[in-house]
């Protein structure tokens, strides 16, 4: 006989969650199988896509401020994608966390780390573009790849700092039916005399803080940056949005669509401590919106590719390249890869955002396949540094 459910103090919502049972309904089991397949596929796609993006942007492209942002976004998404197989396993074994408390804490922390890092990095990208337009001379003098990396490190540190409470308050809780939850247990540390008040205040604090810091504030920064850029460009008589703008717009839209529902349900969940009537709604919806948030990491690499205009043509061309690269012996490639690496190793100062989709000389073999993923969107910038910084404002 086990009495796991009673070994530690739990919040009322957790106690009642522990009563919920796995379903025996056949149609629901089919949905479970579909969910496992979908998450498995997303895991694979996310790992491959983000791995390729990291390789292409990190090793096959001229390093610019923009590629630095994309590099760190892809790194965040790769981390999230790497944790997705474990979530898939959780689904596959009947919604039970069989991997222990430590891994439960780590797995959940990666999810939240990605959430904060994505929000912070998207804010940085928007502010960066705003500075280029509003303070072009300052941007020209201070916008370096090294500076961008330093900003990213600071943002990662902030993301880690914000993730600490989620690591601390994550726990494994045994359900009455024998399954194990990997979930918040805000009574783990100093529960205090009034359990209900502690549960309510801590859950609300967590939900509101992550909504503000990882969603509302980043979106506010993005929106105000976009407004500032639009106003400035209107004065200059610019109309058509550039390619990098389309990329950022797509990534920001995906971020808002994927994370928005999660934050809504997270806030509802916090209310459900004091309002039990919300619990069934939260229990139904939260798994779906959490998966949607995870899928943001799978969607981003696709967006990097889709926002390049010649994507379909390059896709057709690259399919031939795939076959060539598989069938051609390494010696026949004539060391194209290494010469390409030498050519792109310059750490340019304030390179244009168009550099993410710029067209260097056409690579051969496997490098071309990787090239279509992120490269070859716009003409390579030929102008001087100041002109280049100014021209980037059209993007």
């Amino acid at each position: 006989m086990s009495a796991n459910a009673t070994l530690k103090p739990l919040c009322p919502i957790l106690e009642q969650m522990s009563r919920l049972q796995s379903h025996s309904n056949t149609s629901i089991r089919y949905i479970d199988h579909a969910a496992v397949l979908l998450h498995g596929l997303a895991s694979l796609l996310g790992l491959v896509e983000n791995g390729v993006i990291l390789f292409v942007v990190g090793c096959r492209m001229r390093q610019t401020v923009v590629t630095t942002w994309v590099l760190h976004l892809a790194l965040s998404d790769l981390l999230a994608s790497a944790s997705l197989p474990f979530f898939t396993y959780f689904l596959a074994v009947g919604h039970s966390w069989e991997l222990g408390t430590t891994f439960c804490k780590l797995h959940s922390s990666i999810f939240f780390l990605n959430m904060f890092a994505s929000g912070f990095l998207l804010s940085a990208i928007s502010l960066d573009r705003c500075l280029q337009v509003v303070r072009p001379v300052w941007a020209q003098n201070h916008r370096t790849v090294a500076a961008a990396h330093k900003v990213c490190l600071v943002l990662w540190a902030l993301a880690v700092l914000n993730t600490v409470p989620y690591f601390v308050f994550r726990d494994t809780i045994s359900r009455l039916d024998g399954r194990i939850m990997c979930y918040y247990n805000v009574l783990l540390l100093n529960p205090g005399p009034d359990r209900d008040a502690t549960c309510n205040s801590r859950q609300v604090a967590l939900a509101v803080s992550k909504f503000l810091l990882a969603f509302l504030v980043p979106l506010a920064i993005i929106a105000s940056s976009h407004a500032a850029v639009s106003l400035r460009l209107q004065h200059r008589g610019r109309r058509r949005p550039g390619r990098f703008v389309r990329l950022v717009a797509a990534v920001v839209a995906a971020f808002a669509l994927c994370w928005g529902p999660y934050h809504v349900f997270s806030l509802l969940e916090a209310r459900a401590h004091a309002n039990p009537g919300l619990r069934p709604l939260v229990w139904r919806g939260l798994p779906f919106v959490t998966s949607l948030a995870f899928f943001n990491s799978v969607a981003n690499p696709v967006l990097y590719v889709l926002t390049c205009p010649d994507m379909l043509r390059k896709l057709r061309r690259s399919l031939r390249t795939v076959l060539e690269s598989v069938l051609v012996d390494d010696s026949e490639l004539g060391g194209a890869g290494s010469s390409r690496r030498r050519r792109t190793s310059s750490t340019a100062r304030s390179a244009s955002p168009l550099a993410l989709c710029s067209r260097p000389e056409e690579p051969r073999g496997p490098a071309r396949l990787l090239g279509w993923l992120l490269g070859s969107c716009a003409a390579s910038p030929q102008t001087g540094p100041l002109n280049r910084a100014l021209s980037s404002t059209s993007s």
Partner: antibody, heavy 122, light 107 residues
Framework: EVQLVQSGAEVKKPGASVKVSCKAS????????IEWVRQAPGQGLEWIGV????????HYNEKFKGRATLTADTSTSTAYLELSSLRSEDTAVYYC???????????????WGQGTLVTVSS | DIQMTQSPSSLSASVGDRVTITCRAS??????FSWLQQKPGKAPKRLIY???TLDSGVPSRFSGSRSGSDYTLTISSLQPEDFATYYC?????????FGQGTKVEIK
Amino acid sequence: EVQLVQSGAEVKKPGASVKVSCKASGYAFITYLIEWVRQAPGQGLEWIGVIHPGSGNSHYNEKFKGRATLTADTSTSTAYLELSSLRSEDTAVYYCARSGSSSFDYYAMDFWGQGTLVTVSS
Amino acid sequence: DIQMTQSPSSLSASVGDRVTITCRASQEISGYFSWLQQKPGKAPKRLIYAASTLDSGVPSRFSGSRSGSDYTLTISSLQPEDFATYYCLQYANYPYTFGQGTKVEIK
């Protein structure tokens, strides 16, 4: 037809233990929870705890933690309540009741056993 | 723990009368609430769950309603077999708690 049939009345001395059984029939025993409730003579109802027969996992009212033990035998579809260190104030009728839950919601005590009178007297 | 305050503790009524019993929860329970009927020497029987849903086999003269944290059991036309003690139960949070009971007696 759902039925919960409990064991007969017991008379115990203070400090002793008592084990009350509750045999379920007419439904899938392992897919429902079994709750235990007691009622002292002329008094109201008091919740003791709940057990999931399929897993053996249980949850107790703090008041009974350490003294009450809930178990279940799936082969005979029987749930048990064992109460130790009996005191005179434990004299009561002990009831078992069935509760259900789904993946997203739960409800409480739709069917009850007939009750078992436990008398604690020296 | 959530306290369930039931009133009245007892009432006398005649057959055909409309009877109302109320229960107040000390904190939000959002309809995780039942009404039980108990006759002398018998086990309790659930009449209503989720605040207002009638159990199968329970006569339609019984009804449950909710207004904020106040829950009401109404017997529209009291029948001889309805003379019993009625308890309310909250099952929103552990430990589940019951009201003190309302004894409905023949006037």
